[in-house]
């Protein structure tokens, strides 16, 4: 797909006048809550505070420059960016002993891209090289979309860094939630 | 035996609040999210949120999004839905309903409904 | 959100006819489709969930298929206790959504 080759370490992202665009929360990678190896004790408990903080699935707006290369957009183009949580924690303490790990109590939603837009944007290139026209796919919204523990890895690349869910027939062992993703709990709407 | 119990009716001037009790007892409250559904009279069913009885987060339906919390109370295993600013169209019956899940097939469904409690809104 | 457009809105039949509800979400919701029957004056009862899996307890005449954004609702053979509005659900996408409902009354 000829749009993701704009979408590389030399695009240039600016944040538009009056957003200060935060990165979406650290979804844990390899911290699969795992009874063997944690001792069924998460590092802190997520569930400590009741505080409810504005937290959702939202869209950032962003401006960047699309790059192919040494040629850059004469213009900027301004996409979305999917960022944020859909929904309260969907995880519940189960004591184990006296030790506890962690299972869902609800599906797993993901903040993720919904529609797209096509933008044909025009690059222009040093050493008096032609100007070239290209079209990009750019974010147009964004939806809480399901993530099933059935989604293998090259899947859940489109839903950012997520621990796979465990394969069919085995049960499922929720990862304990981050500090930060837990300093309040969430309140959201869809 | 499982079961949901709500708080009986209430008739409402436009502009009150209303609060929406949901007791549940035959399984451990604290196990199950508790989600709310509306139906209003000739409309279809309408999901308006969810609640960990844990922690207290909720997420709720952008439609009622600044006029609807739902709260807890897990000493008494209760789940509390109020509504504010109540309108005309907010007249519907509103249930309480627990999320059960299909370990195989990674499924989640509303599996036990309270017996509604119906909100007429009107001056 | 996602729509889900049930169809018809409402239907006449008789005690051993074969009835058939469809249900189109928007978009697409894999098997995420659940199905419940209403009466007047109680809360909705859960028949099928994950398109085609039968509630426990729920008798076999019930049967949903589908994928995607089609999905059916069949009734092999209706029964006087079978008049009532059915409801589909989606559980792909928040906010959960669910059909507008189909009305099966008694001919």
């Known amino acids: 797909q000829g749009w993701q080759a704009f979408k590389n370490d030399a695009t240039e992202i600016i944040p538009e006048l009056g957003e200060y665009p935060e990165p979406p929360p650290e979804l844990e990678n390899n911290k699969t809550m795992n009874r063997a190896e944690n001792g069924g004790r998460p590092p802190h408990h997520p569930f400590e505070t009741k505080d409810v903080s504005e937290y959702s699935c939202r869209e950032l707006h962003f401006t960047r420059y699309v790059t192919d290369g040494p040629c850059r957009s004469a213009k900027p183009v301004t996409e979305l960016v999917c960022s944020g949580q859909c929904g309260p924690a969907r995880l519940l303490p189960n004591a184990i002993g006296r030790g506890k790990w962690w299972r869902p109590s609800g599906p797993d939603f993901r903040c993720i891209p919904d529609r797209y837009r096509a933008q044909r944007v025009q690059l222009l290139c040093p050493g008096g090289e032609a100007p070239r026209a290209r079209k990009v796919r750019l974010v147009a919204s964004c939806k809480c979309k399901r993530l099933t523990r059935f989604h293998n890895q090259s899947e859940l690349k489109d839903f950012g860094t997520e621990a796979a869910r465990p394969q069919k027939g085995r049960k499922p062992r929720p990862r304990a939630r981050s500090a930060k993703a837990n300093q309040a709990e969430l309140e959201n709407a869809y | 035996e499982v079961q949901l119990v709500q708080s009986g009716a209430e008739v409402k001037k436009p502009g009150a609040s209303v609060k929406v009790s949901c007791k549940a007892s035959?399984?451990?409250?604290?196990?199950?999210?508790m989600h709310w559904v509306r139906e209003a009279p000739g409309q279809g069913l309408e999901w308006m949120g969810e609640i960990n009885p844990n922690s207290g987060g909720a997420g709720y339906n952008q439609k009622f999004k600044g006029r609807v919390t739902m709260t807890t109370d897990t000493s008494t295993s209760t789940a509390y839905m109020e509504l504010r600013s109540l309108r005309s169209d907010d007249t519907a019956v509103y249930y309480c309903a627990r999320l059960g899940y299909d370990d195989i097939y990674d499924d989640w469904y509303f599996d036990v409904w309270g017996q509604g409690t119906t909100v007429t809104v009107s001056s | 959100d996602i729509q889900m457009t049930q169809s018809p809105s409402s239907l006449s039949a008789s005690v051993g006819d074969r009835v058939t509800i469809t249900c189109r979400a928007s978009?697409?919701?894999?098997?995420?489709l659940n199905w419940y029957q209403k009466k007047p004056g109680k809360a909705p009862k859960l028949l099928i969930y994950y398109t085609s899996r039968l509630l426990s307890g729920v008798p076999s005449r019930f049967s949903g298929s589908g994928s995607g954004t089609d999905f059916t609702l069949t009734i092999s053979s209706l029964q006087p206790e079978d008049f009532a509005t059915y409801y589909c659900q989606q559980g792909d996408t928040l906010p959960y959504t669910f059909g507008g409902g189909t009305k099966v009354e008694i001919k």
């Open positions: 978009q697409d919701i894999s098997n995420y």
């Open positions: 035959g399984y451990t409250f604290t196990d199950y999210n």
